[in-house]
């Protein structure tokens, strides 16, 4: 029986040209994490395997950095990076757990404008 739950950073926004950390955490299970896949809309970004370590897809090598931990750092963000990201935890003996993060990449001026309105 799968008892675990995935906690994620949920919906996040970041500035164009900046970077962001995508983070998921598996809790409430003693299952062993054998691999974590990071995906974006039917594209493989990276894999972290318990035995083999990290594999970053060639097309993302310049903009994706492994970690911290099982998370993923996206760099040099563009508006095209806006969308859904998934962390897929492969565990033994539970099976697969999936977490979802929505990232919105904002134009620099929009991000700054939004920040000014949030500060009294």
């Amino acid at each position: 029986m799968m008892t675990g739950t995935i906690e994620t950073t949920g919906n996040i926004s970041a500035e164009k040209g900046g970077s962001i950390i995508l983070q998921c955490h598996l809790s409430s299970t003693t299952a062993q994490v054998t691999q974590v896949n990071w995906e974006q809309q039917d594209q493989l970004l990276a894999i972290c395997n318990a035995d083999l370590g990290w594999h970053i897809s060639p097309s993302f090598k310049d903009r994706v950095a492994p970690g911290p931990g099982l998370g993923l750092t996206l760099q040099s963000l563009t508006v095209n990076d806006t969308g859904e990201y998934f962390c897929i935890y492969h565990t033994y003996p539970d099976g697969t757990y999936t977490g979802r993060i929505f990232l919105e990449v904002l134009e620099s001026s929009v991000a700054e404008h939004g920040a000014r309105f949030q500060i009294p």
Partner: antibody
Framework: EVQLLESGGGLVQPGGSLRLSCAAS????????MHWVRQAPGKGLEWVAY????????SYADSVKGRFTISRDNSKNTLYLQMNSLRAEDTAVYYC???????????WGQGTLVTVSS | DIQMTQSPSSLSASVGDRVTITCRAS??????LNWYQQKPGKAPKLLIY???SLQSGVPSRFSGSGSGTDFTLTISSLQPEDFATYYC?????????FGGGTKVEIK
């Protein structure tokens, strides 16, 4: 250099048994899942069986389930395929393949021919 | 089981030609699609993994694209050593399945 070397193929009668071996070198064998894939003469590729690196969980094609057993000895860096109740349709070249990250087969052995005939 | 349908089953082309091979899955397989090249009497060789990632050491004239159910292998400028049979393979779920193959022959 990664190397996979199959052995154990040969001519066997229908209903007979054979054990194939795949000797691995050049990488940490226990860290990788492994597949057996076969190819009948003049035909395409057919997946046969799969075994995980350390956990040892396995999976089989329906065509061989209950007759073939995949296993591994990580201390010997060797993968095995025990083939029982062999049929004429099992005649093929059998390849072992390494599977990093569970998604693709990046290295293959040269294959060993199994012929089932009376 | 997931069926993989490759087309065409064979094609004739000349050195320098752009060649496109397609592979269709019977259900969505996300990016879990790999391409292999096989020459007579030899083991298959990995060309493209995860739909679009070029395997280390494979010439950049090979490229892969697609996701979901429809995938494409493209050879931008066919070379003499590229005449071979090409297979797609899904690793989304077991049983793993291969396409029927596409034989690329010299025109």
């Amino acid at each position: 250099e990664v190397q996979l070397l199959e052995s154990g193929g040969g001519l066997v009668q229908p209903g007979g048994s054979l054990r194939l071996s795949c000797a691995a070198s050049g990488f940490t064998f226990s860290s990788y899942s492994m597949h057996w894939v076969r190819q009948a003469p003049g035909k395409g590729l057919e997946w046969v069986a799969y075994i995980k690196g350390s956990a040892g969980s396995t999976s089989y094609a329906d065509s061989v389930k209950g007759r073939f057993t995949i296993s591994r000895d990580n201390s010997k860096n060797t993968l095995y395929l025990q083939m029982n109740s062999l049929r004429a349709e099992d005649t093929a070249v059998y390849y072992c393949a390494r599977v990093p990250y569970g998604v693709w087969m990046d290295y293959w052995g040269q294959g060993t021919l199994v012929t089932v005939s009376s | 089981d997931i069926q993989m349908t490759q087309s065409p089953s064979s094609l004739s082309a000349s050195v320098g030609d752009r060649v496109t091979i397609t592979c269709r899955a019977s259900q969505s397989i996300s990016y879990y699609l790999n391409w292999y090249q096989q020459k007579p009497g030899k083991a298959p060789k990995l060309l493209i993994y995860a739909a679009s990632s070029l395997q280390s050491g494979v010439p950049s004239r090979f490229s892969g694209s697609g996701s979901g159910t429809d995938f494409t292998l493209t050879i931008s400028s066919l070379q003499p050593e590229d005449f071979a049979t090409y297979y797609c393979q899904q690793s989304y779920s077991t049983p793993l399945t291969f396409g029927g193959g596409t034989k690329v022959e010299i025109k």
